[in-house]
């Protein structure tokens, strides 16, 4: 049958030539076993059919084997994240084999060409794995493919082509362009490994989405909604406009997936948890902080395989840098009545006081309009572990819905600064911790005084009945 064109065809041509007349062609895919944490060390290049390097370099057949697969590149040189990931894997899994899949010659192309090369690179990895499987004690179940961007889809192809089933594939912000909505055999999918977990950090519903938006694994985790990552704003990244471009913002958000994974390796004592939710908006409302029926999971390396889950979308908030862990709280505030509110939309602020620390003043993000005589749910998160919550301070401000109302507000404020007529009545706040799954009810410190005007504060303490514990699994219990 005729050989296809392109790199795959050239590879097939080379493989089918008799040994004697095979030309000296440099492989476009190289496998570098990183035998040392030292970046200066050259490592060992593994070669299909040559067992000597495996022995010489101490390849451990019974240990875990990681294959790190980079993505498309605009430079002919490895990006900085690779060193961090290799180093973190060596630190966490001291006996493991860490292999860098170097496909730079095929990745340093026009993006469309690099995409077309992913299949041949996946095939090359699969053939290496098939060969390793012929060795005693080597198990495909111990293989973990970690692919970043385009490399995630390369890992998918490798998992698809290999004889047997790879233990795990982690997709670190799998590439979006040319893969969004593609057939499962042409992108990373849950069928490519026994467990496929994915971190999405640069997805956009408008403009170009560098990372894939659709879920492509058993669990798909969307930190900070999968779009705008803290610490990656123009101001954060550029310092001043003279020193950078939007490219740095893209790199920061896209690459954040790698750093979240590195964080999960090196900060094992500070695991980040994600919570299953149908969409980002519901998560922002604080509705999805449940761990029942495997609805929460650690992210990154510590993620647990969930049976019968496919394309399970999970969400979490993070800090701007390592360690990325935050502490999530669901807050349910029952607004009993509005008084003289007009068109004013309240914005709530809370300060949480705990046995370990106190939070900063935290705004409650309003996803939908605040309902009167109804329970409103919010998500808040803190960067520090507050311990057991003791009390909550609540304040609110009015945000006008129109310029006319803003003018009315200003006039009203100038004539009567504290406008005692505008009040909200809040008697209790129910809080649930995502990390501990504990539920608590906080009652107004003075039950006779539960009305609050803008700028004033209301204090809530644990209600007499104290802790409201539900029989829900605490994610912290699942840790080794």
């Amino acid at each position: 049958s005729p050989t296809p064109f392109g790199p795959e065809g050239q590879l097939a041509d080379e493989l089918h030539k008799p040994k004697a007349i095979q030309t000296e062609v440099k492989p476009s895919v190289r496998f570098n076993l990183r035998t040392s944490k030292d970046p200066e060390h050259e490592g060992c290049y593994l070669s299909l059919g040559h067992s000597q390097p495996l022995e010489d370099c101490g390849f451990n057949m019974t240990a875990k084997t990681f294959f790190i697969i980079h993505g498309w590149t605009m430079s002919g040189i490895f990006e900085n994240w690779l060193h961090k990931l290799v180093s973190a894997l060596h630190t966490r899994e001291k006996d493991a084999n860490v292999v860098v899949v170097d496909w730079l010659p095929l990745a340093h192309q026009l993006y469309t060409d690099a995409v077309n090369n992913t299949r041949v690179v996946g095939h090359s990895i699969a053939r290496m794995l098939d060969w390793l499987q012929e060795k005693d004690d080597f198990s495909l179940g111990n293989v973990h493919l970690i692919g970043y961007s385009l490399g995630a889809h390369v890992a998918g192809y490798a998992g698809n082509f290999v004889k047997g089933t790879v233990g795990r594939i982690t997709g670190l912000d799998p590439a979006g362009p040319m893969f969004e909505g593609a057939d499962i055999h042409k992108r990373l999918s849950p069928d490519d490994a026994d467990f496929v977990d994915v971190l999405h950090t640069y997805t956009r519903s408008f403009g170009l989405s560098i990372g894939i938006q659709m879920p492509v694994g058993h669990i798909d985790i969307y930190p900070n909604g999968g779009d705008f990552q803290p610490g990656c704003g123009l101001n954060d990244v550029l310092g001043s406009m003279a020193y950078g471009t939007i490219t740095e913002v893209v790199k920061c958000e896209h690459e954040r997936a790698v750093h979240l994974f590195v964080d999960s390796l090196v900060n094992q004592d500070k695991p980040s948890f994600a919570f299953q939710c149908t969409d980002s908006n519901r998560f922002k409302k604080g509705i999805c902080l449940s761990c029942r029926k495997n609805r929460c999971n650690s992210i990154g390396y510590n993620a647990k395989k969930m049976r019968n889950k496919r394309n399970s979308k999970m969400y979490l908030k993070t800090r701007a840098g390592m360690p990325f862990r935050v502490y999530h709280y669901q807050m349910k505030i029952h607004v009993f009545s509005y008084k003289n509110m007009g068109e004013i939309e309240p914005t709530f602020y809370v300060t949480l006081y705990g046995t370990n620390a106190d939070s900063q003043t935290l705004p409650l993000e309003i996803v939908e309009r605040i309902e009167q005589n109804a329970t409103n749910t919010f998500l808040v998160y803190t960067e520090e572990d507050l311990g057991d919550l003791l009390k909550i301070q609540l304040t609110w401000e009015g945000a006008s819905q129109s310029w006319y109302n803003l003018w009315k507000e200003l006039r009203s404020y100038l004539s009567q600064p504290h406008n005692p007529g505008r009040e909200l009545n809040i008697r209790r706040i129910r809080v649930k911790s995502g990390e501990t799954q504990r539920k608590l009810t906080f009652c107004a410190e003075d039950p006779e005084n539960t009305s609050i005007s803008p700028g004033r504060e209301l204090w809530f303490r644990k209600c007499r009945d104290g802790w409201r514990m539900k029989n829900e699994t605490s994610p912290t219990v699942e840790l080794p």
Partner: antibody
Framework: QVQLVQSGAEVKKPGASVKVSCKAS????????MHWVRQAPGQRLEWMGG????????TYNEKFKDRVTITRDTSASTAYMELSSLRSEDTAVYYC????????????WGQGTTVTVSS | EIVMTQSPATLSVSPGERATLSCRAS??????LHWYQQKPGQAPRLLIK???QSISGIPARFSGSGSGTEFTLTISSLQSEDFAVYYC?????????FGQGTKLEIK
Amino acid sequence: QVQLVQSGAEVKKPGASVKVSCKASGYTFTDYTMHWVRQAPGQRLEWMGGINPYYGGTTYNEKFKDRVTITRDTSASTAYMELSSLRSEDTAVYYCAKGDYYGGSYNYWGQGTTVTVSS
Amino acid sequence: EIVMTQSPATLSVSPGERATLSCRASQDISNSLHWYQQKPGQAPRLLIKYASQSISGIPARFSGSGSGTEFTLTISSLQSEDFAVYYCQQSNSWPYTFGQGTKLEIK
């Protein structure tokens, strides 16, 4: 032991081009990236670009992108840096430096090549 | 690009004393920071890589620390051969950039 030996000093006229060579020995030339860094008199070091000798892929500092070309000859284990449209402010010492596996730090440097641009 | 700022520009220390050199990055560079020593008429010499990793052949009196945006090179007990110019370099993102240098001189 690892050695990087650069070509000799050059004096050029403004508008001309210069090509500096860097011959590597003591390691597998194609396994590590090679970078070019320059230093004008009394100035900080300035990274110009790098090459992956395995297949010739390059990356350049935007500041020099239109004027610099980095190449290599794997059979001679030699990297080259050519800078065109020379101006007086290009007067500097030009160094080649061997990157680590990831291309981040430079443990070995050439002795430097002085390029003087003067009319 | 990431701007690297070193301080002080000049540091006067007596032999046998401790010297502390600082380097600040304009944005988070994690541990992708390397220190070099340069003497007049010579090429730079790598002292510390990836913020704190030592280099074989470099005396143990040289040590590095820091992460994110703030980094320090410490020379525990200065020897006469340590008086030189010291540069920091980031490899977190292209283009790689160097600090303006700190000149370490004899007091």
